[in-house]
């Protein structure tokens, strides 16, 4: 059931996000999410998992884009790309906006 | 969009209890801790407690521990509060809030007789 | 008696700069992070600043936050009439095992 907490050793992660006490969080793997809102510069965010590791196999979108670890701090330095938009087709001396 | 409804409040004598609902929508629940904090009228913010994501740990303010119960049910999106032997000093706005960002519209308790 | 000490008052004129400052200990803004929350009247709080210094999406950059030690300000610049309200830091305490909050700033744009 992937909505059951994971019970394995936990390991200590950089939390950098709204949800945050501290610098680091413990967890059963360490995430980076670079989110994308509806009109906005995206936000990368740097925390713990310990729910929905099926979130972890996602491909990147241009929305968002979840990438995790399972080693000490090894979500500190991870960068994360979105997917680039696929422009629709464009029609000869039509202007792009 | 996240969104969190509170309901619940309402006129109690001392002594009463209510049970405070949070209906939490537009992200994915279970994946959040969720806190209450309160707002006595014409003062600051007070927080009350909070569950983590499974509900297996939660954490209270001293004065609220043995009184009040949080709880949620991640198959309903929902976070509640019990509130045991209330007191005329916990008259206030309780709000329900996904740590650490968003806060819904808060629901008014009153204890008085 | 809150557990982050702020000033009650703050007041500044149109296109001012103005700093809240939060004053705490070593088990709360000393060893954690600091957010800022900015309350409108009658409306709830809204999250301004997270991590010490960042602001959310939709925040705009005339708000900054800083820490130093167990002390944070909240920075306010080009101060507007619409920035009047109440201001709250807050962290998580790990000696009572909770989150505590500033007693509140009330900001008038004067």
């Known amino acids: 059931d992937p909505v059951k907490p994971s019970r394995g050793p936990l390991v200590t992660c950089t939390c950098e996000s709204p949800h945050c006490k501290g610098p680091t969080c413990r967890g059963a793997w360490c995430t980076v999410v670079l989110v994308r809102e509806e009109g906005r510069h995206p936000q990368e965010h740097r925390g713990c998992g310990n729910l929905h590791r099926e979130l972890c196999r996602g491909r990147p979108t241009e929305f968002v884009n979840h990438y995790c670890c399972d080693s000490h701090l090894c979500n500190h330095n991870v960068s994360l790309v979105l997917e680039a938009t696929q422009p629709p087709s464009e029609q000869p001396g039509t202007d792009g906006q | 969009e996240v969104q969190l409804l509170e309901s619940g409040g309402g006129l109690v004598q001392p002594g009463g209890s209510l049970r405070l609902s949070c209906a939490a929508s537009?992200?994915?629940?279970?994946?959040?801790?969720m806190s209450w904090v309160r707002q006595a009228p014409g003062k600051g913010l007070e927080w009350v407690a909070n569950i983590n994501q499974d509900g297996s740990e939660k954490n209270y303010v001293d004065s609220m521990r043995g009184r009040f119960t949080i709880s949620r049910d991640n198959s309903k999106n929902t976070l509640y509060l019990q509130m045991n032997s209330l007191r005329a000093e916990d008259t206030a706005v309780y709000y329900c809030?996904?740590?650490?960002?968003?806060w819904g519209q808060g629901t008014l308790v009153t204890v008085s007789s | 008696q809150s557990v982050l000490a702020q000033p009650p008052s703050a007041s500044g004129t149109p296109g001012q700069r103005v700093t809240i400052s939060c004053s705490g200990s070593?088990?709360?803004?000393?060893?954690?992070?600091v957010y800022w929350y900015q309350q409108l009247p009658g409306t709830a709080p809204k999250l301004l600043i997270y991590g010490n210094n960042k602001r959310p999406s939709g925040v705009p950059d005339r708000f900054s936050g800083s820490k130093s030690g167990t002390s944070a300000s909240l920075a306010i610049s080009g101060l507007r009439s619409e920035d009047e309200a109440d201001y709250y830091c807050?962290?998580?305490?790990?000696?009572?095992?909770?989150?505590?909050f500033g007693g509140g700033t009330k900001l008038t744009v004067l």
């Open positions: 809030a996904r740590e650490f960002d968003y």
């Open positions: 807050a962290a998580w305490d790990d000696s009572l095992n909770g989150r505590v």
């Open positions: 537009g992200f994915t629940f279970s994946s959040y801790a």
């Open positions: 070593s088990s709360n803004i000393g060893s954690n992070y």
